[in-house]
Amino acid sequence: GILNLNKMVKQVTGKMPILSYWPYGCHCGLGGRGQPKDATDWCCQTHDCCYDHLKTQGCSIYKDYYRYNFSQGNIHCSDKGSWCEQQLCACDKEVAFCLKRNLDTYQKRLRFYWRPHCRGQTPGC
């Protein structure tokens, strides 16, 4: 769920998601359109695709709560719970580490980026 994602991103990146990523660029935060603005934005676009896939599989992506462990900088998704819970954790883990990998190219100007400026082809999943 969204609480899992926020906590995980904060633990992995050290940034408060609500201040740094939701929203950011054209794809971080709710919704998404156009060409991603940078590598961080690409992380979110890929994450949107991951969620879209789970939605087609019938998963409640915003409601499902999963268990995971954060230890020594790594995320271990628990193998407990339902198929959806496990897959959701995998999606969130991937975006958290993607955002961390791209901290060096994070652009403050893309924080609260005006979505009408998001043009171009929205990448397919």
């Epitope: 599989q57 019938g58 499902d64 193998d79 407990k80 719970g81 959806c84």
Partner: antibody
């Protein structure tokens, strides 16, 4: 080889508390990934999952019965327990314990079941 | 929770006849699991991850499906196949079972 066996009171009066025991062998609940569920089946009817306990003592309950259920384990004695409070005639059923490994999403070994009759 | 609806609820088949039992999910699931239960016995795992036969299950059984529609098929009915079959999902919490299909031999 994996075996599970349930035991219980057989007959209870309405409003009493049901205590069930699942004794198992062939695996350990201290092994990561292992878990045991309780599942019930009223006579001539379908199966209803009740609760699950994991190797690390994490627990899950059926939301529709959560307030009445309590699952626990004794790892050293290879036993899992289920308590159901305030039983009623609708709780009359055969109660099974079954094993599930977390990486799989089904119950691979089942006990023979123990029958409960609740009289009003 | 996901509701699994099995059809038919009861059916009979002659030896050698092809049998198909259906399981419909109220929302999409990734995999379906099937159990066989005979009177006085506990359910036995029969098919896992939609199409894989559990150990000891005869090759005349098969499973298929995706999304909300799944089925168990017996290519040629035999007397020992008379039983009740249940589908089950743990795609999302809580795990749920179908109401069962009782298969009788003619």
């Amino acid at each position: 080889q994996v075996t599970l066996k349930e035991s219980g009171p057989g007959i209870l009066q309405s409003s009493q508390t049901l205590s069930l025991t699942c004794s198992f062998s062939g695996f350990s609940l201290s092994t990561s990934g292992m878990g045991v569920s309780w599942i019930r089946q009223p006579s001539g009817k379908g199966l209803e999952w009740l609760a699950h306990i994991y190797w690390d003592d994490d627990k899950r309950y059926n939301p529709s019965l959560k307030s009445r259920l309590s699952i626990s384990k004794d790892t050293s004695r290879n036993q899992v327990f289920l308590k159901i409070t305030s039983v009623d005639t609708v709780d009359t059923a055969t109660y099974y314990c079954a094993r599930r490994e977390s990486k799989y999403f089904y119950f691979d070994y089942w006990g023979q079941g123990t029958t409960l009759t609740v009289s009003s | 929770q996901i509701v699994l609806t099995q059809s038919p609820s009861i059916m009979s088949a002659s030896p050698g006849e092809k049998v198909t039992i259906s399981c419909s999910a109220s929302s999409s699931v990734s995999y379906m699991y099937w159990y066989q239960q005979k009177p006085g016995s506990s359910p036995k795992p029969w098919i896992y991850r939609t199409s894989n036969l559990a150990s000891g299950v005869p090759a005349r059984f098969s499973g298929s499906g995706s999304g909300t529609s799944y089925s168990l098929t017996i290519s040629s009915m035999e007397a020992e196949d008379a039983a009740t079959y249940y589908c089950q999902q743990y795609h999302s919490y809580p795990p749920t079972f179908g109401s069962g299909t009782k298969l009788e031999i003619k």
